[in-house]
Interface confidence: low
């Protein structure tokens, strides 16, 4: 299977009932500490707002959080970490009228109520110690 | 294969200290997540706390701060330490094994049959 470049970066357009699916593996064990992070940006440049930023620090704890106006707010952090070490998962993160709600493999972990509009969206980036294998849209 | 008993159980007064083991045989110990799990009279099982392979821990909200969990990889080992016990601490409490940091029941690789903790006032 061919592996998708990191940072990945795509446009989007999304809105309740969306759903954006990723396949990806921790590049390195869990005792080197990676990353994986999601942001969803309100344009398609980086240093745009974040509506919903997603970090799993493999083996520790995963954040989310949002960025307006270039000023982080308030962290919402869990300490479940459905993730194995070496082990390819499927992220999938659901649009909800309320929040976003992200399911690892096939089970949903992490809530993240919304803070920007959803309709903001204009671009998703993956990136980090991952290798990735699908990303995927769906509306 | 991991073979998990727990240890310690008994009748305490409220407020008093109780330390609860869990023994684990198995090779791979070392590289399993650690929980521990209750269940009173009538309710669910709940999260009470874990200790990940690498040693990070984690107490549930209704125990934080009266809760101390560890463990010893050279005794395939795990150890709850209660302080300030409560009446509503009153449950029977199981140690599970998982290969994944989640504090979810169904989760859980291997269980152990639990052992009582009767907290009077």
């Known amino acids: 299977m061919s592996l998708l470049s990191v940072p990945h970066t795509e446009s989007v357009s999304l809105s309740t009932g969306s759903t954006v699916t990723i396949e990806a593996r921790p590049l390195v064990c869990f005792f080197n500490e990676p990353h994986l992070q999601v942001d969803f940006h309100t344009e398609m440049k980086e240093d745009s707002d974040i509506a919903f930023h997603f970090q799993v620090y493999f083996g520790n704890r995963v954040v989310m959080n949002s960025r307006e106006y270039r000023t982080w707010k308030e962290e919402v952090e869990s300490k479940n970490m459905p993730f194995q070490d070496g082990q390819e998962f499927e992220l999938r993160i659901l649009v909800l009228e309320d929040k976003y709600q992200v399911m690892v493999n096939g089970q949903a972990y992490y809530n993240f109520n919304h803070r920007i509009p959803v309709s903001s969206v204009k671009m998703v980036q993956v990136w980090r110690d991952i290798s990735l294998t699908k990303f995927n849209v769906s509306n | 294969e991991l073979q998990v008993v727990e240890s310690g159980g008994g009748l305490v007064q409220a407020g008093d200290s109780l330390r609860l083991s869990c023994a684990v045989s198995g090779r791979t110990f070392s590289s399993y997540h650690m929980m521990w799990f209750r269940q009173a009279p009538g309710k669910e099982r709940e999260f009470v706390a874990a200790i990940a392979w690498r040693g990070g821990t984690y107490c549930a909200n209704s125990v934080k701060g009266r809760c101390t969990i560890s463990r010893d990889n050279a005794k395939d080992t795990v150890y709850l330490q209660m302080n300030s016990l409560k009446p509503e601490d009153t449950a029977v409490y199981f140690c599970?094994?998982?290969?994944?940091?989640?504090?979810?029941?169904?989760?859980?690789?291997?269980w152990g049959k639990g052992t009582l903790v009767t907290v009077s006032s």
């Open positions: 599970a094994a998982s290969l994944r940091y989640v504090f979810d029941p169904s989760a859980m690789d291997y």
